[in-house]
């Protein structure tokens, strides 16, 4: 970690890459602890922030502006040396979000992908971005970063992901940077949830009154399993939204959701998840496909008032 | 949104102590410090010192250095300002405002009243 | 300590007029100046730092410049709910120092 003998090692908290007006910490570990250190920035714009100043334990930066966006390194103290300072750090880039118009980011095939598989994240824009760059929520290394291709005034990166295992389920935002502006990056395009399935035992899913019904009748899928799944998802083919409910355990010691459908208007094929509270967006195999047929007069769709959208939001906690 | 809420208005005799309490919400508690401002009647604003919410480690301003305690309970974010020994020249507004080592406070608490009188 | 010396420290202005309020630091403060609102009866509120740089939230009536030892805020057209006292302060050196303030009624 250290990467020599007589070099500290600095490193930010939370993460390398920070909203503009935001903060970040900045640690120098040095000899096997947080000692007083220096710091510095590398074009040396910026710098009154340091005016020689001895930080202690670590150094709290912001508001940020786009200024602070670079390279920094410190010099952890030695008071036994003919300096009184170690060599310099590892180099640490700071990029500052929020200089620019978001891109957008979608995923191919999907959002939901079986584990062990590949995703790719397609992160775009019609500003002219030079640079792209993909970043995983709660991660604080640098995020991946790819040349932007420009083709009939879109430009654009593809992030290849996989083969995928749970470390790598997430929500993901992309990034654009400008020539000249490397560490300037764009606002963050919207949240897209990367969920893993396929890593636990499937629940089972049934209706209620059955799976076909009469126009206009009410109808509630329920999702249960013997495993101890904190939450449940449920999805319908064809749509992309899914609904999430608590489980509840039942007396038979089974844990369950109670997924109100409302009243029958329109059939369709579900299928519902487990996940655990821990591992949010890490999903069981999928239940068997459930028909659910309407007999009657069908019309457009089924109403759906609570369904999030499944961009975002699935891999944050239900409180 | 950030937002940081002082404890109540307190009335104490001379040589008492005090514990004025503000608590964080709306960001990580941890990635920035906790900055204390006092504001004596007909007086402007005076920096007291600060408190680094990352590593815990407080600085104070020369004028508040021996009576004065800055302290973080991380676990409910919230950082606390302690005056111990009060004189009547502690009637103060007392703020605290979100900062860190570059010494901007971009939000700050709603001020918590200190009157200190026999 | 650097000394941050505010000034007018009174100003009274009608509604669209625009107004300046200077403050001179002792000392080269590098551009790390902050200026702050606080409104009868609030808490401040921060309206500009590193000279120029408006807070999340700020109109862009207000804005800030200078260098070395001077530096101004200025309200471009100033309206009703700009009545208060503003702080200039310096985020350059421990301990960090306010100006004595500016008091801005509206006529």
């Known amino acids: 970690l250290m990467g020599g003998q007589d070099k500290p090692f600095l490193s930010a908290r939370p993460s390398t890459v920070v909203p503009r007006g935001g903060h970040v910490a900045l640690q120098c570990h040095y000899r096997r602890g947080f000692n007083n250190f220096m710091l510095y920035k590398e074009d040396r714009s910026h710098v009154p922030i340091f005016h020689g100043r001895i930080f202690q334990e670590s150094f709290i930066m912001g508001p940020v502006t786009p200024a602070h966006a670079g390279t920094y390194r410190c010099r952890g103290s030695r008071p036994h040396s003919l300096t009184g300072w170690s060599a310099p750090s590892n180099p640490l880039v700071i990029m500052v979000t929020g200089n620019h118009r978001k891109p957008s980011l979608l995923a191919h095939p999907g959002p939901l992908l079986k584990s062990g598989e590949t995703v790719i994240l397609q992160c775009w824009s019609d500003v002219m971005f030079e640079h792209f760059f993909l970043h995983r929520e709660g991660i604080s290394e640098d995020p991946s970063r790819l040349v932007g291709q420009i083709h009939d005034g879109v430009s654009k990166a593809n992030f290849s992901i996989g083969p995928l295992m749970p470390v790598l389920a997430g929500t993901y935002r992309c990034y654009g940077s400008v020539p000249h502006s490397p560490y300037q990056l764009s606002a963050p395009s919207d949240p897209l949830d990367i969920v893993i399935t396929g890593l636990y035992e499937k629940p089972s899913l049934s209706a209620q009154p059955g799976p076909t019904v009469q126009a206009g009748e009410n109808v509630t899928l329920s999702c249960s399993s013997w495993s101890s799944y904190d939450i449940y998802h449920l999805s319908r083919e064809g749509e992309a939204h899914e609904r999430r409910l608590r489980a509840v355990p039942k007396v038979n010691r089974t844990f369950q959701a109670d997924f109100p459908l409302g009243p029958a208007t329109h059939g369709g094929t579900y299928r519902c998840f487990g996940s655990f509270r821990a591992l949010p967006c890490v999903w069981s195999n999928s239940s068997d496909p459930l028909l659910v047929s309407v007999t009657g007069n069908p019309s457009s769709s089924w109403p759906s008032p609570t369904e999030p959208s499944s961009k975002s939001g699935i891999c944050r906690h239900l409180h | 949104q950030v937002q940081l809420v002082q404890s109540g208005s307190e009335l104490k005799k001379p040589g008492a102590s005090v514990k004025v309490s503000c608590k964080a919400s709306?960001?990580?508690?941890?990635?920035?410090?906790m900055q204390w401002v006092q504001k004596s009647p007909g007086q402007g604003l005076e920096w007291m010192g600060w408190?680094?919410?990352?590593?815990?480690?407080?600085k104070y301003a020369e004028d508040f250095k021996g009576r004065f305690v800055f302290s973080l309970d991380t676990s409910v974010s919230t950082a606390y300002l302690q005056i111990s020994s009060l004189k009547a020249e502690d009637t103060a507004v007392y703020f605290c405002?979100?900062?860190?080592?570059?010494?901007?406070?971009?939000?700050w608490g709603q001020g918590t009243t200190v009157t200190v009188s026999s | 300590d650097i000394v941050m010396t505010q000034s007018p420290s009174f100003l009274s202005a009608s509604v669209g007029d625009r107004v300046t309020f200077t403050c001179k630091a002792s000392q080269d403060v590098s551009t790390a100046v902050a200026w702050y609102q606080q409104k009868p009866g609030q808490s401040p509120k921060l309206l500009i730092y590193?000279?120029?740089t408006r807070h999340t939230g700020v109109p862009d009536r207000f804005s800030g410049s200078g260098s070395g030892t001077d530096y101004t805020l200025t309200i471009s057209s100033v309206q009703a709910e700009d009545v208060a006292v503003y702080y200039c302060?310096?985020?350059?050196?421990?301990?960090?120092?306010f100006g004595g303030g500016t008091k801005v009624e509206i006529k």
């Open positions: 709306g960001y990580t508690f941890t990635t920035a410090g």
């Open positions: 405002a979100r900062g860190g080592d570059e010494g901007v406070m971009d939000y």
């Open positions: 590193w000279t120029s």
């Open positions: 408190i680094n919410s990352h590593s815990g480690v407080p």
């Open positions: 302060q310096q985020h350059y050196s421990t301990p960090w120092t």
